[in-house]
Interface confidence: medium
């Protein structure tokens, strides 16, 4: 698989980690999260051309079949390969609690 | 998350398991795989409308941000949640070997 910078579509256009700033209101969390009031959401965005960051055998198959049957089989999709944990301070019935979420922020990306 | 049959876009249009028949030639495997000569490839295809089969918190965030910034943040994508193993009989330098691939056939799907 090509490395992350070797995008045949041009620099930065292939599957990679992006950061999107979002408020609690944007996320629909304002009524249950106290802090942070703004989240730097890391997510996987970009195209998955042939064999670029292919996650596994399934991704390779998908690429091959997409070439043959583009109307039936979609191209692989840029999704998180792993996550970074994030702590939220949230409201509870009895007060406030710290909660760690392991599946909230993308850490790195691949195509599948 | 809604269950697999509760697709707001109409029956069968949301993220679910599909089977695509593919030959070794289709997959580009003809020179190293002996058998099977045809594979029933199970893969995840379909739309991921709001919270449909959301895999985790990240998928929920992605849905919210896609609504706000559709040109920047893509909708969640339909990908395998788990895989079924598949045995391939492949040619090796010394003869023929049985190889089990754990990441070849999608078993079930979710949106992420």
């Amino acid at each position: 698989a090509r490395n992350g910078d070797d995008c045949p579509l041009g620099p930065g256009r292939c599957c990679r980690l992006h950061t999107v700033r979002a408020s609690l209101e944007d996320l629909g969390w304002a009524d249950w999260v106290l802090s942070p009031r703004e989240v730097q959401v890391t997510m996987c965005i970009g195209a998955c051309p042939s064999q670029f960051r292919a996650a596994n055998m399934h991704a390779q198959i998908k690429t091959s079949l997409h070439r043959l049957k583009p109307d039936t089989v979609p191209a692989p999709c840029c999704v998180p390969a792993s996550y970074n944990p994030m702590v939220l301070i949230q409201k509870t019935d009895t007060g406030v609690s710290l909660q760690t979420y392991d599946d909230l922020l993308a850490k790195d990306c691949h195509c599948i | 998350a809604r269950n697999g049959d509760d697709c707001p876009l109409g029956p069968g249009r949301c993220c679910r398991l599909h089977t695509v028949r593919a030959s070794l030639e289709d997959l580009g495997w003809a020179d190293w795989v002996l058998s099977p000569r045809e594979v029933q490839v199970t893969m995840c295809i379909g739309a991921c409308p709001s919270q449909f089969r959301a895999a985790n918190m990240h998928a929920q965030i992605k849905t919210s941000l896609h609504r706000l910034k559709p040109d920047t943040v893509p909708a969640p994508c339909c990908v395998p949640a788990s895989y079924n193993p598949m045995v391939l009989i492949q040619k090796t330098d010394t003869g023929v070997s049985l190889q089990t691939y754990d990441d070849l056939l999608a078993k079930d799907c979710h949106c992420i």
Epitope: - | L34, S35, I89
Partner: antibody
């Protein structure tokens, strides 16, 4: 260690039915296609039926088509052969075999179970 | 359907001598890349045992005195130096397409 253990054989009258079972162990049953092969007394081997790993592809020899049904229960690691409308020429030792996939070979065989069709 | 015809029906060989068994298919069991022909040995009172797969590939654990060759319609199993434990019936089998078929068998005995 791979093991295939057949059961369910016995004596049955022509026109009768019998259900053979094959209990598999020592490998991931759900990953492998399976077949039944039979051998009439003093005769050669005859392939009977094939079922793919997920049970979606099934093939039969012409001699048993419409009378025999191959099936599997991957949750129980068990292969079955339902035999209806039995004929005297179905008398044989029935072997459960691991067939891997289509276009493959039989790499493991059970010890066989004997089916006798006689009036 | 591809009918497999084995020859000879039986073979008596002296210990240490070479044995050759032939299998002819009524139509090709090969593709441009592979031959879907396999060989089995069956000893008295036992289930068959795989010897050779895809015409020429030795199954793991099988002595290298066994070898297979051929393509298309004509295939051969050879035992370079026959040993006492090689007594039994040998079958060819194709898996080019369904229905899979076996040859009629060749009985190998010690002279």
């Amino acid at each position: 260690e791979v093991q295939l253990v057949e059961s369910g054989g016995g004596l049955v009258k022509p026109g009768g039915s019998l259900r053979l079972s094959c209990a598999a162990s020592g490998f991931t049953f759900s990953s492998y296609a399976m077949s039944w092969v039979r051998q009439a007394p003093g005769k050669g081997l005859e392939w009977v039926a094939y079922i793919s790993s997920g049970g979606d592809n099934i093939y039969y020899a012409d001699t048993v088509k419409g009378r025999f049904t191959i099936s599997r229960d991957n949750s129980k690691n068990t292969l079955y052969l339902q035999m209806n409308s039995l004929k005297t020429e179905d008398t044989a030792v029935y072997y459960c075999t691991r067939a891997l996939v289509e276009n493959a070979y039989f790499d493991y065989w059970g010890q066989g179970t004997t089916v006798t069709v006689s009036s | 359907d591809s009918v497999l015809t084995q020859s000879p029906d039986s073979l008596a060989v002296s210990l240490g001598e070479r044995a050759t068994i032939n299998c002819r298919a009524s139509k090709s069991v090969s593709t441009s890349t592979y031959s879907y022909m396999h060989w089995y040995q069956q000893k008295p009172g036992q289930p068959p045992k795989l010897l050779i797969k895809y015409a020429s590939y030795l199954e793991s654990g099988v002595p290298d005195r066994f070898s297979g060759s051929g393509s298309g319609t004509d295939f051969t199993l050879k035992i370079s130096r026959v040993e006492a434990e090689d007594v039994g019936v040998y079958y060819c089998q194709h898996s080019r397409e369904f229905p899979w078929t076996f040859g009629g068998g060749t009985k190998v005995e010690i002279k």
